[in-house]
Interface confidence: medium
């Protein structure tokens, strides 16, 4: 029997082949086996299906970094990394996603949905949409909706001050955040670490915290693959 | 154009109640959250509460956290509170104001407010 | 709650001279935060939000400055119309607390 999605676009598509096991995978942009990207998938949380596109959990990555770097993404997939602006812009433009947040400190965890979720492109400066709260973290998101992302070197945020370079990291500030998950690892300095802002506060960095998207319709889907 | 209309406010007796309503035009009523905010007469402005676009979180001042409810009927296009056990206090004139983000919010567009007396 | 001091309390100036109002939050607010003008009998209007940006419509003889817990309120030129209450508030954290209003009026 042929798989069901031979390319597969994202993590819900490889989950639909039969693939239930977090980890690496390819998938194709648009279908297009020309258009190969390595993802972590994770398949466990809230159904599976998504995409891991940002992991912070020790600190060996350095996410003080330019536009080039977060354009194209860098880390190891399986560690700390970021998949890249590109990457993420053409991923949310094969159709509508959803966006999931975990966060984890010393036992305690947290996460938020939004049920729609894209990042437009190089010309629009990856603007953010985000809309649809639910979860136990808390609405900080919404603050960056329609935030164009920012690094040290493009200042794109609503400042005077270059938020990217005042707050050591590179998100989609506006004046400057709520959320800055790519921010300096275990800094608990005002705003300057990694911050949830509705969980732990400004003042608190966080251990673990991961971003990832699927299908808002994932639910769907994989209500139809469990009919086949 | 956008615009807030409060009404409901008048002449109330100490321990008594009161409900404000805030009738909103000319924007997406239910992207937005929207607050209440008051000021006494000759004073400054205080926030008094404040709600979510779904309507799902509200946020109040200590000083009407049990005794003021915040609420809305997005397909009304209307914004509410309900005071009770109304104290000389809480003599203000109430501004129904629209916020831009939600929790933490910058109040853009501002009703003419209405004026609330709580005296015997 | 995050306490917000506003100064001068009152500011008699003349039309054309450049006006300058402080507001110190009592604790670190990165940018978040508004500034209000109030005429009397009037609602309060939105002047400048986020620190710096100005809302669509104010003259830009109006211009906010500032981050962490020091902001500045600037009129470039005072105009007759300018004679207000003029009021910061922190958009932080909930309660939004304000300043307690500066009165702008004519010397």
């Known amino acids: 029997i042929g798989l069901l999605y031979p390319f597969p676009r994202d993590c819900s598509q490889a989950m639909l082949n039969g693939d239930t096991t977090s980890g690496l995978y390819t998938i194709y942009i648009n279908g297009d086996k020309t258009q190969a990207l390595e993802v972590y998938c994770d398949m466990t949380s809230d159904g599976g299906g998504w995409i891991v596109f940002l992991r912070r959990k020790n600190g060996r990555e350095d996410f003080y970094r330019n536009w080039k770097a977060y354009a194209a993404g860098f880390g190891d997939r399986r560690e700390e990394f970021w998949l890249g602006l590109d990457n993420l812009s053409k991923i949310t433009a094969q159709g509508q996603y959803e966006l999931r947040v975990d966060l984890q400190d010393h036992g305690e965890s947290a996460y938020a949905v939004y049920d729609r979720f894209s990042v437009g492109d190089a010309k629009s400066r990856y603007k953010l949409k985000v809309e649809g709260y639910s979860g136990t973290a808390g609405d900080s998101m919404n603050y960056h909706n329609g935030r164009s992302f920012s690094t040290y070197d493009k200042d794109t945020d609503s400042a005077i001050t270059n938020c990217a370079l005042s707050y050591k990291g590179a998100f989609w500030y506006k004046n400057c955040h709520r959320v800055n998950l790519m921010g300096r690892y275990g800094d608990n300095n005002h705003s300057q670490g990694v911050n949830w802002f509705h969980w732990k506060g400004h003042e608190y960095s966080i251990q673990f915290a991961e971003m990832k998207l699927r299908p808002s319709n994932f639910r769907n889907l994989e209500g139809r693959r469990k009919r086949a | 154009q956008v615009q807030l209309v409060e009404s409901g406010g008048g002449l109330v007796q100490p321990g008594r109640s009161l409900r404000l309503s805030c009738a909103a035009s000319?924007?997406?009523?239910?992207?937005?959250?929207m607050h209440w905010v008051r000021q006494a007469p000759g004073k400054g402005l205080e926030w008094v509460s404040g709600?979510?676009?779904?309507?799902?979180?509200?946020y109040y001042a200590d000083s009407v956290k049990g005794r003021f409810t915040i609420s809305r009927d997005n397909a009304k296009n209307s914004l509410y509170l309900q005071m009770n056990s109304l104290r000389a206090e809480d003599t203000a004139l109430y501004y129904c104001?629209?916020?831009?983000?939600?929790?933490?919010?910058?109040?853009?567009?501002w009703g003419q407010g209405t004026m609330v007396t709580v005296s015997s | 709650d995050i306490q917000m001091t506003q100064s001068p309390a009152s500011l008699p100036t003349p039309v054309g001279d450049r006006v300058t109002i402080t507001c110190r939050a009592s604790?670190?607010?990165?940018?978040?935060l508004n500034w209000y003008q109030q005429k009397p009998g009037k609602a309060p209007k939105l002047l400048i939000y986020?620190?710096?940006n100005l809302e669509t419509g104010v003259p830009s003889r109006f211009s906010g400055s500032g981050s962490g817990t020091d902001f500045t309120l600037t009129i470039s030129s005072l105009q007759p119309e300018d004679f207000a209450t003029y009021y910061c508030?922190?958009?932080?954290?909930?309660?939004?607390?304000f300043g307690q209003g500066t009165k702008v009026d004519i010397k």
């Open positions: 104001a629209k916020g831009t983000r939600g929790e933490g919010d910058t109040f853009d567009i």
């Open positions: 000319g924007f997406t009523f239910d992207d937005y959250a």
């Open positions: 709600i979510s676009g779904s309507g799902g979180s509200t």
């Open positions: 508030q922190q958009s932080y954290s909930t309660p939004q607390t």
């Open positions: 604790q670190y607010i990165q940018g978040f």
């Open positions: 986020d620190a710096s």
